[in-house]
């Protein structure tokens, strides 16, 4: 718990505690903002972002945004508060340990976004979840 000599400010979002009063450590995320990418037509890609940052607020999670238009492909890596929309979309998968890309509707481009909550989880962005047990082919292998 927070020791008595560490003041807890009122309405302060820099100190986040769980139900037991334990302080939440902030997330460590890849944080290169928007960069050009060569990631295309692959089941998964590495971010190629060399910057790992401490997220400013402990409630923030890691986010990756992959965009493709007629001119280029970009990959964005950031920290973001899942209570707030990002690029006008809610971070539905913020509790996931992996960054599983989901396509979003954006006019004039192909737009995928993922969020996750384990250290540097937005370094490995996954477009096809290989080990998803809802995959019938995988179930067939398991039960053979």
């Amino acid at each position: 718990t927070i020791p008595p000599h560490v003041q807890k400010s009122v309405n302060n979002d820099m100190i986040v505690t769980d139900n037991n009063g334990a302080v939440k450590f902030p997330q460590l995320c890849k944080f290169c903002d928007v960069r050009f990418s060569t990631c295309d037509n692959q089941k998964s890609c590495m971010s190629n972002c060399s910057i790992t940052s401490i997220c400013e607020k402990p409630q923030e999670v890691c986010v990756a945004v992959w965009r493709k238009n007629d001119e280029n492909i970009t990959l964005e890596t950031v920290c973001h508060d899942p209570k707030l929309p990002y690029h006008d979309f809610i971070l539905e998968d913020a509790a996931s340990p992996k960054c599983i890309m989901k396509e979003k509707k954006k006019p004039g481009e192909t737009f995928f976004m993922c969020s996750c909550s384990s250290d540097e989880c937005n370094d490995n962005i996954i477009f096809s979840e290989e080990y998803n047990t809802s995959n019938p082919d995988l179930l067939l292998v398991i039960f053979q």
């Epitope: 334990a22 450590f25 384990s118």
Partner: nanobody, 124 residues
């Protein structure tokens, strides 16, 4: 049980440097990811920097990147923070804290053994 004791704070002019130390007693220091955390007057906690126990990989908040350097000496059970190009906004009480290992570094462990902190004042 790991006890932490910070030292090295003081009054420094803008642009100056300080080196903080955090001495840990206890034999488990080498198991923990260690953090420097600060609290400015009337503000909340700010997570400044972290360092892994093995390999000593380091992480920084954007506000201190390029100015502060975290390091540790596991043989001396000591954590350090070298602070250069100090600014008025770096004025705070600095604490070291340990993050207990969990599954991929649990994010909700108690910061159970805090030191009393060391005050850094940046002023001309």
């Amino acid at each position: 049980e790991v006890q932490l004791l910070e030292s090295g704070g003081g009054l420094v002019q803008p642009g100056g440097s300080l080196r903080l130390s955090c001495a840990a007693s206890g034999s488990t220091f080498t198991e923990y990811r260690m953090w420097w955390v600060r609290q400015a007057p009337g503000k909340g906690l700010e997570w400044v920097s972290a360092i892994e126990p093995i390999g000593h990989r380091t992480y920084y908040a954007n506000s201190v990147k390029g100015r502060f350097t975290i390091s540790r000496d596991n043989s001396k059970n000591t954590l350090y923070l070298q602070m250069n190009s100090l600014r008025a906004e770096d004025t705070a009480v600095y604490y070291c804290a340990k993050q207990a290992p969990g599954e991929k570094w649990a994010r909700r462990w108690d910061l159970d053994y805090w030191g009393q902190g060391t005050l850094v004042t940046v002023s001309s």
